[in-house]
């Protein structure tokens, strides 16, 4: 959402979020690190191209032309400088001048040593308990953001991990149309459209960066879960990793796992949609998870096959009209899981990413809640690894990522909601090792892959 320094009456009224970096001679004297040439405070560039007609409520949602409903001036950083005040480096760069390259390695969770697994689990738990040092979240829409008295900004602190959950919730929530009116649900700024992969890529990159800073460990990387095993068991659901099944309640996590102590945020949908409030930092019930346990839907009781990944990587067009969840021959819709692994759209199909979520059969299978289950992180790093392999194979061909007429939030140049500072889909449509400072240690199955009997 927004930096703590910008959650003030003055900043919100002025529309300017350009915090100081090192103000030597008082507030406002080093906006965006301007005194050291790192950046400048400039007008926000927001995509104004038309979106598809399925969203008919222009003017009613704070996420439109993001982030202009809140701020119209922000830091534009020079060179490899980055961040809300140009005080950090772009992903993949380090040093005082952000001129030295770094590359971190995302590895299979199951390949980590005992110590590394333990470190990852502890780090996630620390992120759940540690207040985000930079961002605060809005608990009201823009028209009520200054509170009943017009002088009390409606923002809250939130933990690093819950911020990760909140940003996802905010991107998928319904459009509130007023008290007594049904909220509009045919909107999603991070799924069912071309931005699905780029949005989730930045989402993970932000969490990874936040955890690196929390740990003071620049090499810290998010591992992945290779969910394409074709099995009906969750191989990472053990107490040394993401938590086994509780013996007392098959929908809960074992008390031997730290994740059994986690409590979810953003579960009060009824309130948000009827009162027009937003999810806040209040934690609620436990994570629910029942892998392969949805007996009413046998098709989601088994994970994707290894060859499903090989097949989806042969779909050469990034996306196809109508750039939605019914696109055929679209790599994005295939990996998202609304098409079968060959790219053919079928309304009954749930494959790859979607199937992995639904297989978890609980918190991780509900869009507005799913990041509350930390398996979400590992599921999406694997999805991102598939995306990165596609970018490598097809030379990051962005030509079929639409500039306009995609679902709202999904145009190529749209600033991804609700990330700060503003970041477009285009910026994430690049090969990660060369442009974003991370790589995957992974072997891709070939088409002929078969499981020996």
């Amino acid at each position: 959402q927004f930096p703590r320094q910008c959650a003030t009456v003055e900043a919100l009224r002025s529309g300017m979020c350009c915090p100081d970096l090192s103000p030597v001679s008082g507030p406002g004297t080093d906006r965006c690190g301007s005194s050291s040439g790192r950046g400048r405070c400039e007008a926000v560039t927001a995509d104004s191209r038309p979106h598809s007609p399925q969203y008919p409520h222009d003017g009613r949602d704070d996420r439109e032309v993001w982030p202009l409903r809140f701020f119209n001036r922000t830091c534009h950083c020079n060179g490899n400088f980055s961040g809300h005040n140009c005080g950090t480096c772009r992903p993949g760069w380090r040093g005082a001048a952000c001129d030295q390259r770094v590359l971190i390695v995302r590895r299979n969770l199951l390949d980590l040593s005992k110590e590394e697994k333990n470190h990852f689990v502890r780090a996630l738990d620390m992120a759940k308990r540690t207040t985000h040092p930079l961002f605060v979240i809005a608990t009201r829409r823009s028209e009520e953001i200054l509170g009943p008295d017009g002088n009390t900004p409606q923002f809250e602190n939130i933990s690093i991990y819950n911020y990760f959950v909140w940003t996802h919730y905010y991107s998928v929530k319904k459009t509130f149309l007023g008290v007594g009116q049904e909220s509009f649900g045919e909107v999603d700024f991070s799924h069912e459209g071309p931005a699905f992969l780029t949005w989730h890529r930045y989402h993970l990159l932000r969490l990874e960066k936040d955890m690196q800073e929390m740990l003071q460990e620049p090499s810290f990387s998010l591992p992945y879960w290779n969910f394409a095993t074709g099995k009906n068991v969750c191989d990472i659901c053990t107490d040394d990793l993401m938590g086994s099944r509780s013996n007392f309640d098959s929908t809960l996590i074992s008390p031997n796992s730290v994740f059994s102590q986690w409590r979810v945020v953003c579960d009060s949908l009824e309130d948000y949609d009827t009162l027009g409030t937003l999810c806040n930092s209040t934690e609620d019930g436990p994570i629910r998870r029942n892998p392969a346990g949805n007996v009413a839907r046998p098709m989601v009781q088994r994970l994707p096959e290894p060859q499903d990944v090989a097949q989806c990587l042969e779909v050469g067009l990034f996306d196809t009209p109508p750039f939605y969840s019914n696109s055929t021959n679209s790599f994005r819709n295939t990996v998202e899981g609304y098409s079968d692994p060959t790219g053919k759209y079928d309304p009954a199909v749930r494959s790859l990413h979607n199937l992995a979520h639904l297989f978890l059969n609980g918190t991780g299978g509900q869009t507005h809640l799913s990041p509350n289950d930390p398996i979400f992180v590992l599921l999406h790093t694997f999805t991102d690894a598939v995306f990165d392999e596609w970018l490598r194979r097809y030379n990051a061909d962005i030509s079929t990522f639409p500039l306009e007429n995609a679902p709202i939030g999904h145009n190529r140049q749209y600033n991804m909601v609700p990330f700060w500072p503003p970041v477009t889909n285009t910026e994430m449509f690049v090969t990660a090792p060369d442009n974003l400072g991370y790589t995957y240690e992974i072997q891709w199955p070939s088409r002929e892959f078969s499981v020996p009997e």
Partner: antibody
């Protein structure tokens, strides 16, 4: 002027527990990570772990996990290292030191004078 | 965990000479490296951070270099006060291990 003032020498029995303090001045400990380092007699430096006094988060080298415990009192700008289950192997000088919160800067820039712990039977 | 191999374990040189101490990391540490000097009975003292940036007040005869897994500390025009132990430390991944140290003696 930045200073880290450590508590005095400790003579302790095997199996006992000791708590060393490090009182800082000249900076706000909430803005820095405080690290601890061990040096056995005529040996090199061993990194123990860090504490972020702003939120109490701690990280330890796995070999010190369970025996070392770091805490902080921001009201008095003091950090503590507690060592339990002491053996003769823990006879050493223990240093507190600080690192800039900006994790990009790779350095422990100011150090305490060290506190000697002698485990004797 | 990253291991830091420091060499030589000890060396002896005369005033005015140049010496080089090296540290090899077991993996790429991307310049997340510091060098410290420790005199007998004293606390370590920061010389170099980010592999090559001299800390405030450190004489220019000290210089750090290197990248990837190989790093060096060079001391030119040796002075008598340069005797002591020298340590490297990485900050790339936890735990932040030190090199085993180099004892420098001035003849």
């Amino acid at each position: 002027e930045v200073q880290l003032q450590q508590s005095g020498a400790e003579l302790v029995r095997p199996g006992a527990l000791v708590k060393l303090s490090c009182k800082t001045s000249g900076f706000n400990i909430k803005d820095y990570f405080l690290h601890w380092v061990r040096q056995r007699p005529d040996q090199g430096l061993e990194w123990i772990g860090w504490i972020n006094p702003d939120n109490g988060n701690t990280v330890y080298d796995p070999k010190f996990q369970g025996t070392a415990s770091l805490t902080a009192d921001t009201s008095s700008n003091t950090v503590y290292l507690q060592l339990s289950g002491l053996t003769s192997e823990d006879t050493a000088v223990y240093f507190c030191t600080r690192r800039d919160y900006t994790y990009e800067k790779a350095a422990l820039d100011y150090w305490g004078q060290g506190a000697s712990v002698i485990v004797f039977s | 965990a990253i291991q830091m191999s420091q060499s030589p374990a000890s060396l002896s040189a005369s005033v005015g000479e140049t010496v080089t101490i090296t540290c090899r990391a077991s993996g790429n540490i991307y310049n997340y490296l510091a060098w410290y000097q420790q005199k007998q009975g004293k606390s370590p003292h920061l010389l170099v951070y980010d592999a090559k940036t001299l800390a405030d007040g450190v004489p220019s005869r000290f210089s750090g270099s290197g990248s990837g897994t190989q790093y060096s500390l060079k001391i030119s025009s040796l002075q008598t006060e340069d005797s002591g132990n020298y340590y490297c430390q990485h900050f790339w991944s936890l735990p932040f291990t030190f090199g085993s140290g180099t004892k420098l003696e001035i003849k």
